[in-house]
Interface confidence: medium
């Protein structure tokens, strides 16, 4: 396969609700009609797949119904949102992009986005 450059932010801080968003941008060498985006999580040298979606250019990304990811695409950019994150989910989230069709097949893997998740402090008891 042929290599392709993928860019993503180095660091993202998840919101207090456990939501993190980042942009994954790929340098498309051709006119791909079918693109697959996969989010991988690397922690303690273990790599696991968080979510994946295949989309046709010009259409929305469609993740599985039970996926913790949502996303939108615009040209060679994919806006990814990961939900339901907790402190234990802190880690390096890698964006992998594959230009599936038409040939040639291209594969690009980003350097990863370090997502920091801080669990919110529990609310103090109210006097009311």
């Amino acid at each position: 396969c042929k290599a392709m450059h993928v860019a993503q932010p180095a660091v993202v801080l998840a919101s207090s609700r456990g939501i993190a968003s980042f942009v994954c941008e790929y340098a498309s060498p051709g006119k791909a009609t079918e693109v697959r985006v996969t989010v991988l999580r690397q922690a303690d040298s273990q790599v696991t797949e968080v979510c994946a979606a295949t989309y046709m250019m010009g259409n929305e990304l469609t993740f599985l119904d039970d996926s913790i990811c949502t996303g939108t695409s615009s040209g060679n950019q994919v806006n990814l949102t990961i939900q339901g994150l907790r402190a234990m989910d802190t880690g390096l989230y890698i964006c992998k992009v594959e230009l599936m069709y038409p040939p040639p097949y291209y594969l690009g893997i980003g350097n990863g986005t370090q997502i920091y998740v801080i669990d919110p402090e529990p609310c103090p008891d109210s006097d009311f």
């Epitope: 396969c1 006119k31 009609t33 079918e34 069709y101 038409p102 040939p103 097949y105």
Partner: antibody
Framework: QVQLVESGGGVVQPGRSLRLSCAAS????????MSWVRQAPGKGLEWVAE????????YHSDTVTGRFTISRDNSKNTLYLQMSSLRAEDTAVYYC???????????WGQGTLVTVSS | DIQMTQSPSSLSASVGDRVTITCRTS??????LNWYQQKPGKAPKLLIY???RLHSGVPSRFSGSGSGTDYTLTISSLQPEDFATYYC?????????FGGGTKVEIK
């Protein structure tokens, strides 16, 4: 040189199953996507299925989805097509093809004939 | 699916003739078009890919051109071994689809 050799064809009754194999040599099999294409007697060419180089992704034509499954074993340099619920209209020569980095189907096997008849 | 209309479906020509086969697609395919040659009882062979690029080992008398939805295969000087059936195929969008074929026969 690139060589693709299909096997497993034959005469089978409607509703039955058959598995085709394609032995690849002369290139690094695990680096290439592979496809099956068929040709009914006296007719044109029809794409059947494709599988990615690693086997992670597969695609099937609407006419065979749910009945045929493409798979591969990179350790054996072999491509497969599992065919079930066969119909008379599946009668054809089945070709194994390699998908090059830059285009579709640059090399083809000699084909194996599948005849579905009672 | 993208429909492929190939014409003519058959033609008769003599050795040395210039032969042109056309392929029209139902959608723009941005040059993602191949041409194959098939002889009776044999597997198809790739002749031209990406509209105009000659596959390795294919004689230079074969050439391809076109854009958008209209594509052409030309054999500049027909040779005895060129009598065969020719198919166009698009791979711009899944599923890849083939034209109905053009049979080139001896006049």
């Amino acid at each position: 040189q690139v060589q693709l050799v299909e096997s497993g064809g034959g005469v089978v009754q409607p509703g039955r199953s058959l598995r085709l194999s394609c032995a690849a040599s002369g290139f690094t099999f695990s680096n290439y996507a592979m496809s099956w294409v068929r040709q009914a007697p006296g007719k044109g060419l029809e794409w059947v299925a494709e599988i990615s180089y690693s086997g992670t992704y597969s695609y099937h034509s609407d006419t065979v989805t749910g009945r045929f499954t493409i798979s591969r074993d990179n350790s054996k340099n072999t491509l497969y097509l599992q065919m079930s619920s066969l119909r008379a209209e599946d009668t054809a020569v089945y070709y194994c093809t390699r998908r090059d980095y830059d285009n579709e189907m640059d090399y083809w096997g000699q084909g194996t004939l599948v005849t579905v008849s009672s | 699916d993208i429909q492929m209309t190939q014409s003519p479906s058959s033609l008769s020509a003599s050795v040395g003739d210039r032969v042109t086969i056309t392929c029209r697609t139902s959608q723009v395919i941005t040059n993602y078009l191949n041409w194959y040659q098939q002889k009776p009882g044999k597997a198809p062979k790739l002749l031209i890919y990406y509209t105009s690029r000659l596959h390795s080992g294919v004689p230079s008398r074969f050439s391809g051109s076109g854009s958008g939805t209209d594509y052409t295969l030309t054999i500049s000087s027909l040779q005895p071994e060129d009598f065969a059936t020719y198919y166009c195929q698009q791979f711009g969008k899944r599923p890849p689809t083939f034209g109905g074929g053009t049979k080139v026969e001896i006049k």
